[in-house]
């Protein structure tokens, strides 16, 4: 009678065991064990037992004692389960953005593990159980379905294996997957508004606003403004499910013409965009030209104005004849046009856009000096003692320099408050002299005496 | 530190009897089988007897065969090796050395330093 | 009765490899395990289970079994490694059972 110790064995894969052979005769002619596993005859004085270790055991065996007695022959097995966790363990590679709203199906494969009739496979978010099943085929495939919500944000889906064999005295052997971490999301269908200027000039600034509501997670979308080629840098504002990126944009006479605008909003794996044309423009102001700024009375004058080629001008009101970029008008100089502004205004169309630019030049006429009666009456009386002040106006550009004396030594205090008396009275040179020449006037002031009764 | 003590050796003529003893220390004595391994001058070294942890089990080299005797104290941490009928063949050192903890794989860890026992007349 | 034999003698060049052979009736069913011993010393063990090393061995001894023979090899053979070296098994009648012995001279 041959038997075996231990008649049932589980052990780790590539493990060792010793198993026992034993006999019931004293002396047997043979006793052994029979497996393809290496195995090793261990020490065990006497000849009706032996010891094997048998090693490296990579899958389910059995060894088979014998033993040759003379009563005859007879075997017995043992049974090496080998135990192994899963290989792999691996959620099958999902988007990490999902859209809430979206049904997201979770595959777990697991690859190896054994016993299988021991061997779990549970889906988990957090540590919640979606799904448990037992492990079958290979590899083994557990999936299930999850309606993504937006309070699935940030949640770590895994998949873990259970190998039990508490039942057999071992322990429970858990493999868990790398997580799955899910990042949700809500993109409006609606494109972002964009709000900018449909024209911008050449060497100035403007401001592009772009905005959008009802997203989720607000401070995970990115905001993509651009001007042609040009990135644009924009301060984004967060709302709770809203944004605003404002950007200045800077144009130059290279970025002339039509020029797209875009503003793109991306989230998880999905975007919005918004597309403007903006007509960049160049328009200086209108160019007023005189023959000369600063003219003596009675020079004829030319008056002058050019503009962009595409621009409508008025000069001075008066629209260009024939309609155009120029207009001109001749003019002889005289005193009132001392201080005169011709003002050019151009009008160009840029993207169905009326633009207007202004430039104004002023005349100086030189004339004079000039001595009126209105402004310096050639006679006063004035009572003695009484207060008074003598007025003389000299007319000319330029303002002409005013000196009345009276025998070229006596000066009538022009422009100053002065009390009557005899010594006033006589004539008075007036002299007017500036660059343009001088003018003489000749005032007499007469003094009243009181009349006493 | 582990260790193995032996005494007892000495001069003693043929036919005649001698007590080796072999001290433990420094591990738990009554976990292991411990041997006692012969070496004659200039010669190898040969197998004399094996005891079991508890006692309770005894081996011996067939050139020993009933005149040895192997025997353990526990209590004391003490191997014995009782000669009788010495043989000048007998002459050689002496030592006890420890079977590792599994003892089914047979091989020696640890080994005294020797005790020399001298048979002639 | 399984009987182990070793060659008396080996000598190796310092740096070279040592082998040294030990044969017996399939050897390899069984474990060899070897020893070291320097004149006037006890026996250490240097390599259990075919080709295990105790800790404090040096990584130069190595061993292996196979078929009828166990070998213990010894690379970069230093000068303290000149000693005599034991191979050792069991067998069921007698239970221990010794080599011979070889004695391995490192030259120079």
């Known amino acids: 009678q041959t038997s075996v110790s231990p008649s049932k064995v589980i052990l780790p894969r590539g493990g060792s065991v010793l198993v026992t052979c034993s006999t019931s005769c004293d002396q047997p002619k043979l006793l052994g064990i029979e497996t393809p596993l290496p195995k090793k005859e261990l020490l065990l004085p006497g000849n009706n037992r032996k010891v094997y270790e048998l090693s490296n055991v990579q899958e389910d065996s059995q060894p088979m004692c014998y033993s040759n007695c003379p009563d005859g022959q007879s075997t017995a097995k043992t049974f090496l389960t080998v135990y192994w966790t899963p290989e792999r363990v691996e959620l099958a590679p999902l988007p990490s953005w999902q859209p809430v709203g979206k049904n997201l199906t979770l595959r777990c494969q697991v690859e190896g593990g054994a016993p299988r009739a021991n061997l779990t496979v549970v889906l988990l978010r957090g540590e919640k159980e979606l799904k448990r099943e037992p492990a079958v085929g290979e590899p083994a495939e557990v999936t299930t379905t999850v309606l993504v919500r937006r309070d699935h944000h940030g949640a770590n889906f895994s998949c873990r294996t259970e190998l039990d064999l508490r039942p057999q005295g071992l322990e429970l052997f858990e493999n868990t997957s790398a997580p799955y971490q899910l990042q949700t999301f809500v993109l409006p269908a609606t494109p972002p508004q964009l709000v900018s200027p449909r024209v911008l000039e050449v060497d100035t600034q403007g401001t592009v606003v772009c905005s959008l509501d009802g997203l989720f997670p607000v401070s995970e979308a990115q905001v993509h403004l651009a001007l042609g080629d040009q990135r644009l840098n924009p301060t984004v504002t967060y709302g709770n499910d809203s944004f605003s990126a404002k950007a200045s944009v800077s144009v130059t006479a290279e970025d002339e013409g039509t020029q797209r605008l875009t503003c793109a909003v991306i989230l998880g794996n999905q975007s919005q965009e918004t597309l403007q044309t903006v007509t960049i423009y160049s328009f200086p102001a209108p160019n007023v030209i005189l023959t000369k700024p600063e003219v003596s009375e009675g020079t004829e004058v030319t008056v002058k104005c050019e503009a962009h080629p595409r621009a409508k001008v008025t000069l001075n009101g008066v629209p260009a004849q024939p309609l155009g970029p120029r207009a001109q008008l001749l003019l002889k100089a005289t005193p009132e046009d001392n201080g005169r502004s011709f003002s050019c205004s151009a009008t160009l169309e840029v993207a169905g856009q009326l633009i207007h630019k202004n430039q104004t030049r002023e005349l100086r006429v030189l004339y004079g000096p000039r001595l009126d009666e209105r402004d310096c009456p050639g006679n006063w009386t004035w009572p003695e003692n009484s207060q008074q002040t003598p007025m003389c106006q000299a007319w000319g550009n330029p303002l002409p320099e005013l000196k009345c004396l009276k025998d070229g030594t006596f000066p009538l205090p022009i422009g100053e408050s002065v009390t009557v008396t005899r010594d006033l009275e006589g004539t008075y040179l007036c002299r007017a002299r500036s660059t343009q020449g001088e003018v003489t006037r000749e005032v007499t002031v007469n003094v009243l005496s009181p009349r006493y009764e | 530190q582990v260790q193995l003590v032996e005494s007892g050796g000495g001069l003693v003529q043929p036919g005649g009897s001698l007590r080796l003893s072999c001290a433990a220390s420094g591990f738990t004595f009554n976990s292991y089988y411990i041997n006692w391994v012969r070496q004659a001058p200039g010669k190898g070294l040969e197998w004399v007897s094996t005891?079991?942890?508890?006692?309770?089990?005894?081996f011996y080299a067939d050139s020993v065969k009933g005149r040895f005797t192997i025997s353990r104290d526990n209590s004391k941490n003490t191997l014995y090796l009782q000669m009788n009928s010495l043989r000048a063949e007998d002459t050689a050192v002496y030592y006890c050395?420890?079977?590792?903890?599994?003892?089914?794989?047979?091989?020696?860890?640890?080994w005294g330093q020797g005790t020399l026992v001298t048979v002639s007349s | 009765d399984i009987e182990l034999t070793q060659p008396p003698s080996v000598s190796v060049a310092p740096g070279q490899t040592a082998r040294i052979s030990c044969s017996g009736d399939s050897l390899g069913s069984k474990y060899v395990h070897w020893y070291q011993q320097k004149p006037g010393q006890a026996p250490v063990l240097v390599i259990y289970s075919d080709k295990k090393r105790p800790s404090g061995i040096p990584e130069r001894f190595s061993g292996s079994n196979s078929g009828n023979t166990a070998t213990l090899t010894i690379s970069g053979t230093q000068a303290e490694d000149e000693a005599d070296y034991y191979c050792q098994s069991y067998d069921s009648n007698p239970m221990l059972v010794f080599g011979g012995g070889t004695k391995l001279t490192v030259l120079g």
């Open positions: 050395a420890r079977t590792t903890l599994n003892y089914y794989y047979g091989y020696m860890d640890v």
């Open positions: 005891i079991s942890s508890d006692g309770s089990n005894t």
